[in-house]
Interface confidence: low
């Protein structure tokens, strides 16, 4: 199911505005013109190619008429050369033969970039898309007819003086070549010199194929069909009664109008050749909405066709195509997933009237900033009992700034770094504390989007406990009894408890043990001591807490 | 033929969890998106989470983002629902649904599982 | 968040009769919208897609028009097995259904 889409290789920092979402095609847009891409603000070409796949030839007989085709063309369409059906003619199949995605499947699809350069937009991440809007206000959709395989139509040879550049049923020839019909059946390109005959065809004969261009003026809403013949013909509709065509134009069909045309020419016999003509809907009923949920817009592409107002043409006539890389699917949507962020893709998206191109865009669309990578190399240290130190490399990928966390269980802080810091001093941390650290880079895009962390860690010095807590002296005759709580700050790893006592500035006792439960025997009755009760942590002693008690007098005198 | 069939609805107490399954066959399923709706007991329906056909997009309502997680295994066409720190208004009929992404419409659904919550 | 107000809530009609449902939006969500039906005990079933689209299956008689904030469902001559509830649903913004309108026999 692999399938390689062709980006353009490039990352853009300013794509035109194109319709998406809730945009309309535009009013001044006229969809089957050439694409004007000298006003683009961007570095890159837009082209409207056919399809790949597109095996999309009808054969109509000259007796059944109803299958006239409307084509894309996407170069200035004027005479077009009629059609020679050859024997591959025949076995050329009608759309549906391309894959199907199911309905409402998403194309898991492989797409492969080519590399892209190291410009980094510093324009928070916007999903960029260009698609090719032609902006003429008149422009061709050519519709062609052609005759069934075992006509035996004497086609008159025809010059065409353009190059359309779709890729349908119809020979486009450039200027100064010539077709004629081989025996075989198999189209021959001569030199403009041919012999005549003398015996006039038939009209039904001379006007088998003729190639019809649908002009649309998005002014008035309405087509003109232009019939692609050297002679100015007469065109008569079913009343038989006037000629309704001006230099071979039909003029001021609504969208949807389906009617037969009687065209005739003295230089024919039979009277006439009936030619249906079918007008398909105005260009900007369909509108192609960018469906791509934000959070998935970094590795995903999702393409919609929607109608935005209704018509009366027949929908059963209305196809859609995508084209991303080389797979086609036949669907109003796609969904493409596992893409590469921050790169340009191509898609291009048909619609097809009655079999044939309608409208053709092609898509650029740039997905989003990807997620950022690791910070890399990343070592972190205590500096003494109150400050350490992170270092890190930046990621590969593009980021806009990092977060820096550290955790000492349970507290949290965590700091938005700018993104050209390599390092980072933290300060005020508290002493002999394990300090978690977790670094990680993010982008703001159309979401967030936060990098892998980072992390590492380390344990700041010791530092002079706080003074112990809560210290009760409970007094006798002779003795003293000391309690005391666990300072709030123990800032080492884990020592004894002290307690120093004095008569005067003599030291009487000098007492150590892991619990602050101390019994001070044999003192002098009725005495003023002083008590100092300290933590000492293993490296340093905190601040003493002195309190001064005497001992009781004497109770058995 | 297409179908869904949910599992895993049971009577749990305020605060509880159940975790509730949606086994599919009859299509591809990691070629769709996929939709939980529920409906209280005389009420209407209510979206409840839908998730991508990867599983990299996934949408839930206010009233039960935090509290329910939405998941699938491709591998084993199965859709899950965790529902943690259940409440009483979490009471209803629980569906399945296949989203057909292009329409938005989910034009294939179980026969539901009844979830009740209550001390 | 969209939200969807049905009317009417409730609605009494006889077969043969034509029916009109109308969904409103809080804000515009073009053509986002599909129709449900509900019989009791029974899971939705799908009857209208992007506003106006039938899906397969479905009789020609419910048809569905509307956009941007205001759609219709419409039941061109109503049949015994029409009588149910009926929801609409948005999808252009998260996912919000309509409450509801019982459709029930005068």
């Known amino acids: 199911q692999g399938s390689t889409l062709s980006p353009t290789g490039r990352r853009t920092t300013k794509m035109p505005s194109v319709p998406l979402s809730s945009d309309p095609l535009p009013t001044h847009t006229t969809a089957f013109s050439p694409a004007s891409i000298s006003e683009r603000e961007n570095d890159f070409s837009e082209t409207t190619p056919s399809l790949s796949s597109d095996n999309t030839s009808t054969q109509v007989s000259p007796d059944s008429l109803d299958n006239a085709s409307a084509f894309n063309t996407t170069g200035v369409s004027s005479a077009l050369t009629p059609h020679l059906p050859t024997h591959a003619d025949s076995q050329t199949p009608s759309t549906g033969t391309d894959t199907q995605t199911p309905s409402g499947s998403a194309a898991n699809t492989t797409l492969s970039p080519t590399p892209r350069s190291n410009d980094i937009s510093d324009v928070p991440g916007e999903r960029s898309t260009a698609s090719t809007f032609p902006t003429d206000p008149i422009s061709p959709l050519a519709t062609t007819l052609i005759p069934a395989r075992n006509s035996s139509a004497a086609l008159p040879a025809r010059t065409s003086n353009t190059t359309i550049t779709a890729n349908t049923s119809v020979s486009y020839l450039n200027a100064s070549e010539t077709t004629t019909p081989s025996p075989s059946g198999s189209t021959v390109i001569s030199t403009p010199t041919i012999a005549t005959t003398t015996s006039k065809p038939t009209c039904a004969e001379k006007y088998a194929t003729i190639p019809v261009d649908y002009l649309y003026n998005n002014k008035t809403k309405l087509f003109t069909a232009k019939l692609n013949v050297n002679e100015n013909v007469e065109c008569t509709n079913n009343n038989h009664t006037h000629n309704i065509c001006t230099n071979n134009e039909v003029l001021n069909l609504p969208e949807c109008k389906e009617m037969n045309v009687f065209v005739s020419h003295n230089s024919c016999t039979d009277r006439h050749k009936e030619l249906k003509l079918d007008v398909p809907p105005e260009v900007e009923k369909f509108q192609l909405d960018d469906c791509t949920p934000d959070v998935e817009a970094n590795t995903t592409i999702c393409l919609k066709w929607k109608i935005i107002e209704t018509f009366a043409c027949d929908k059963s006539k209305i196809t859609y195509r995508f084209q991303c890389g080389n797979k086609t699917y036949n669907k109003e949507g796609i969904y493409l997933e596992n893409l590469e962020p921050e790169y340009e893709y191509k898609c291009d998206s048909e619609i097809l009237y009655n079999n044939h191109k309608y409208i053709n865009i092609t898509k650029l669309i740039k997905t989003d900033f990807g997620i950022p990578g690791q910070p890399q190399n990343v070592v972190c240290r205590h500096e003494d009992a109150h400050q350490g130190v992170i270092t890190w490399n930046p990621p590969q990928r593009s980021f806009h700034n990092f977060t820096l966390c550290y955790v000492n269980k349970p507290a949290k802080k965590c700091l938005i770094l700018d993104k050209h810091l390599t390092t980072y001093h933290l300060q005020n941390l508290k002493p002999y504390t394990n300090y978690s650290l977790s670094l990680h880079a993010y982008i703001i895009a159309k979401v967030q989007r936060n990098g892998t962390a980072a992390t590492c860690n380390f344990t700041t010095e010791s530092a002079p406990p706080s003074q112990v807590q809560n210290m009760i002296v409970s007094t006798s005759d002779n003795s003293m009894h000391v309690k005391c709580e666990v300072p709030r700050d123990v800032n080492g790893p884990t020592g004894l408890y002290h307690l120093e006592v004095e008569a005067g500035n003599t030291l009487v006792r000098n007492l150590s043990q892991s619990k602050c439960d101390f019994s001070v025997n044999n003192l002098q009755y009725s005495t003023y001591y002083n008590l100092k009760a300290y933590y000492h942590n293993g490296k340093y002693s905190g601040e003493p807490v002195i309190l001064r008690e005497s001992t009781s007098y004497n109770s058995k005198a | 033929e297409v179908q869904l069939l949910e599992s895993g609805g049971g009577l749990v107490q305020p605060g509880g969890s159940l975790r509730l399954s949606c086994a599919a066959s009859g299509f591809t399923f990691n070629n769709y998106w996929m939709t939980w709706v529920r409906q209280a007991p005389g009420k209407g329906l209510e979206w409840v989470s839908s998730i991508s056909s990867s599983g990299g997009s996934i949408y839930y309502p206010d009233r039960v983002k935090g509290r329910f997680t939405i998941s699938r295994d491709n591998s084993k066409n199965t859709l899950y629902l965790q529902m943690n720190s259940l409440r009483a208004e979490d009471t209803a009929v629980y569906y399945c649904a296949r989203d057909e992404r292009w329409a938005g419409a989910m034009d294939a659904w179980g026969q539901g599982t009844t979830v009740t919550v209550s001390s | 968040d969209i939200q969807m107000t049905q009317s009417p809530s409730s609605l009494s009609a006889s077969v043969g009769d034509r029916v009109t449902i109308t969904c409103k939006a809080s804000q515009n969500i073009n053509k986002n919208l599909d129709w449900y039906q509900q019989k009791p005990g029974k899971a939705p079933k799908l009857l209208i897609y992007?506003?106006?689209n039938l899906q397969t299956g479905v009789p020609s008689r419910f048809s569905g028009s509307g956009s941007g904030t205001d759609f219709t469902l419409t039941i061109s001559s109503l049949q015994p097995e029409d009588f149910a509830t009926y929801y609409c649903y948005q999808h252009n913004s998260r996912f919000t259904f309509g409450q509801g309108t019982k459709l029930e026999i005068k």
């Open positions: 992007e506003t106006n």
